[in-house]
Each structure stands twice: as C-alpha cells, then as structure tokens.
C-alpha cells in the first residue's frame, strides 16, 4: 500500500523533539501554497490554503514519520497554527511506483483577504534540541476580492464580487451618454462616471430596492467627446460602503433606432477597491 497522510492540529512542540535521534530524515524538496475554494454545509464557500510538499528521493525517507506545517498570518492581528501530517505507511521506495517524487498535500488553513502568510514545514523526527533542523519555508500573500478564487469569500460577495452589471454605454449625441447596467440585489445606490483623462460626466443612480436583478438606465450629460471614454460604475452597498468593487465599460456610438444595441466587449472589467 502507498503511504498517504492523516493530518491534525498540533499546537505545541512535537513529542519527537524531546527525544535524541541518531539519524533524521532529510529536508523537503519543495513546498507550495495556493488558495482553494471549498464548499461548506451552509452552501457558502470557504477559502483555504492548499499546502503541497514534495519529499526528497533518497533513503532518508525511510525514517520519515510525519511532516509538520505551521502558518503565521499577519494582517490586522497575528495568527499562528500548526498541523502534523502523519504518514500512514513506511516508505518502501524513494519514488512513487508510477514515477516521480512522493507528493502530499493538506487543505485546511483558512485564508483571509490581503494577508501575508509565512508557511514553514519540517519533517519529523526533526533535528535534536540543540541542532538546526532542515526545514522549508515560504511567504504567501493572499489576494483581494478581485482574485478568481477570493471573490467567493462572503465579504467579497457582499462587496459585489459575483455581481456582473453587464454595462453597456453609448454616445447618444455630443452632449449625452446613455448607460445601461444590471442592478444588484445587494443595494440600490450607484455612481456612474464617464472619463477620458479626466471626468467628463457623472450621475448618481438610485433604484428602488429589489430582491431581483433588473436593468437600469441613466442618461449622463458630458462636457467633452465621449466616444471611447471609460464608464466606471461604483456601487454603494450597505456591507461595503464606499469600498465596493468598481466595474468598467467603454462608450461606443449608439445604434440607429430599431437596431439592436451592440454588446460592449470590455464590459464589467474588474476595477479595484476605491481609494
């Protein structure tokens, strides 16, 4: 049978650390981290770290009992947690029977937005108390709500990360631009800006609160040539206030009456957090 890992929390030092070991397994060959989206019972999503590691291919893995992974997170407050992953079998070969190094992974450390994490891993039994043991570490900075994984975090969803306003904007005449967009059930106040190098027009939009998505339309007076200008739609949802995710589109010429409105290929480009 091939070894697998069984992982569980281990907050204090590993018991092996207190024992003297004549020989210890070598260090890890590789350590990687990426955020992954996992579904939870409530139908919500949880973003966790997928920590994967590769074992060095030599006879020292015969001594390997476990690998310990510790994560320190630094944002508004500091967090620290460790897991110990025990190998279910002794290693009978230095590489997988199908070829390639032994590779394992653990999914479980929660990932917060825009946080710097320090991930360290070492093999057990590790070096003796007064010796420097081989270990591997890396830094991982979690992205914000615009990331394709992080956008599923509850805080991001409440800031409109999953909302696609499907913006269309067209120049009606030299003085006005018509902006259409799909509203969000998250809120009813929006700001639409038209800008080239500077802001050439804007309008506040307030729609009646609705639990469903509807199309809103606003005609915005502009002070300059608007064709090719950028439209920026900023929502003001109660959950994120002025820190909600902006969306962008481009102004095109309005079609002739009776011709279908052309979809703007640049619609709903993710913007960022408002400064």
């Amino acid at each position: 049978r091939e070894p697998t890992v069984q992982c569980g929390s281990e907050t204090g030092p590993s018991p092996e650390w207190m024992l003297q070991h004549d020989l210890t397994p070598g260090d890890l060959r590789d350590l990687r981290v990426e955020p992954v989206k996992t579904s939870v019972a409530t139908g919500d999503y949880s973003i966790l770290m997928n920590v994967s590691w590769v074992l060095r291919a030599d006879a020292s893995i015969r001594l390997l009992k476990a690998t310990k992974i510790c994560v320190t997170g630094k944002s508004n407050f500091q967090s620290y947690s460790c897991v110990r992953c025990n190998y279910t079998e002794a290693f009978q070969t230095q590489t997988r029977p199908s070829g390639g190094k032994w590779t394992f992974s653990y999914i479980g450390f929660p990932v917060e937005l825009n946080t710097v994490y320090f991930i360290g891993a070492h093999n057990i039994p590790n070096a003796n108390m007064n010796e420097d043991g081989p270990s591997m570490s890396l830094n991982f900075t979690s992205p914000g709500c615009l990331d394709h994984i992080m956008k599923y975090k509850k805080k991001c969803v409440k800031a409109g990360s999953l909302w696609d306003p499907n913006i269309t904007a067209c120049k009606k005449n030299e003085e006005t631009v018509e902006v259409n967009f799909t509203t969000s059930p998250l809120g009813n106040r929006y700001m639409a800006l038209i800008q080239h190098s500077t802001i050439i027009g804007f309008s506040q939009v307030s729609e009646p609160y609705q639990n469903k998505q509807t199309r809103a339309s606003v005609v915005i007076p502009v002070t300059e040539e608007s064709e090719g200008a950028m439209v920026q739609l900023t929502p003001y949802f109660p959950t994120c206030g002025s820190d909600c995710i902006r969306h962008k589109g481009t102004v095109v010429l309005c079609p002739q009456t009776g011709v279908p409105f052309p979809l703007d290929n640049n619609r709903s480009k993710p913007g960022g957090w408002l400064p």
């Epitope: 291919a57 030599d58 006879a59 015969r62 230095q94 590489t95 029977p97 070829g99 390639g100 190094k101």
Partner: antibody, heavy 118, light 107 residues
C-alpha cells in the same frame, strides 16, 4: 526482462567531450532513477551522479559537477551522460545502472570504454 | 561524503571455504548497504541490498549482516564461480560511495 544497452567504445583526445547513451527496456523508464558509475582500469567503482527520468532532476557527485551533463529522452527510454574537457585519467569504463526501490543498483549496462589519449 | 572502507583488499581461499568480507562506513548508514560481485570484463552484479536481502537469482550461500557503521558479507561455502571482486556500497543519500573492493582468489 530489464535491459540497459549502452553505446559503443570511444577514443577521444584530451580536451574533447564524450556522450554515452543508455537505452532502457523491460520496465517503465520514468519510474526509476538512472545512475552513472565509472571504473578506471584496475580500479574501483565511482558514482558520478543520477537522473530522475520523470522530471530530469539531477544530482551530481561534486567531483564531476563542472564537467558532466546528464540528460534523458523519455520518448526513446534513453539516458545520456556527457563528460567534457576530457583528461587522460578519465579513461575508464562508464556504466549506467538503474536504481531499485532505493539507490542500490539492481541493473547495469554492459559498460562503455572511453579511452582518452593524445 | 561517507567513506566506505573494505577489508581485506584481497584474500585467497579454497572451494568450500567460508569467506567473510567486512565493510565499515565513516558514519551511520542505517543499514542502507548493498553488495556487488564483479568478474573481469563484466559489469557488477547486485548480490544483496538492505544488508540482508538477496537479489533475484543470487544463491543462498551469500548472506549479509551488520548495522550502524559495520557490515559483513559472508559466503558460507565458496564455489568456483564465486572467485571475483566484491564491493560494498552505501545508499544513505547522495553522493553514493563504494568500498575499495575485495578480490577473492583461488588458493
């Protein structure tokens, strides 16, 4: 059955390079490390390094690190060892040897005699 | 690097003799040791690995023992085809090294 078949004998001048091939058959090439071991006339065995055909990871004996290059071509299940800047004391039989579960050498090629002479 | 010291470097023995070859590692190799037999003009042949495990097709008169740094290869009853040179090798992590060899000759 497992077979490792090496390229033929070579005569080289000092300063030249030699490339020895080792064609594997009878097993899944990417599943085991391939080692290179040399033996000078009347001398013992000397490990030069190893390559993992799965991902081309290489570990060299420091003694040869600057002069040896190990490669592989998985499409033809062949490993290669190139030794550059040859000297007369590189005259030896060069063997490829496949690792077992760990790095005991379960199968050996027939050997390739490389003679370095001016 | 781990040094492997083999002794004796050569020995003379007769058919039927019990022959013992020793191999000492410069540090603990945790029983990661193999023995090879080599005949003139031929590639080495694996005899034992992990100290005591016989490789495929190797006669049971060959046996191995030892742990830590000291290891022994024993041929219980020497046969004519056993006259050859024997090498030990550690595989406790690269670089792998061999003993200097023991030549077993006919007395």
């Amino acid at each position: 059955q497992v077979q490792l078949v090496q390229s033929g004998a070579e005569v080289k001048k000092p300063g030249a390079s030699v490339k020895v091939s080792c064609k594997a058959s009878g097993y899944t090439f990417i599943s085991y490390w391939m080692n290179w071991v040399r033996q000078a006339p009347g001398q013992g065995l000397e490990w030069m390094g190893r390559i993992d055909p799965y991902d081309s990871e290489i570990q060299y004996n420091q003694k040869f690190k600057d002069r040896v290059t190990m490669t592989r071509d998985t499409s033809i299940s062949t490993a290669y060892m190139e030794l550059s800047r040859l000297r007369s004391d590189d005259t030896a039989v060069y063997y490829c040897a496949r690792s077992g579960g760990f790095d005991w050498f379960a199968y050996w090629g027939q050997g390739t005699l490389v003679t370095v002479s001016s | 690097d781990i040094q492997m010291t083999q002794s004796p470097s050569s020995l003379s023995a007769s058919v039927g003799d019990r022959v013992t070859i020793t191999c000492r590692a410069s540090e603990n190799i945790n029983s990661n040791l193999a023995w090879y037999q080599q005949k003139p003009g031929k590639a080495p042949k694996l005899l034992l690995y992990d100290v005591t495990n016989l490789a495929d097709g190797v006669p049971s008169r060959f046996s191995g023992s030892g742990s830590g740094t000291d290891y022994t290869l024993t041929i219980s009853s020497l046969q004519p085809e056993d006259f050859a040179t024997y090498y030990c090798q550690h595989f406790w992590g690269p670089p792998y090294t061999f003993g200097g060899g023991t030549k077993v000759e006919i007395k």
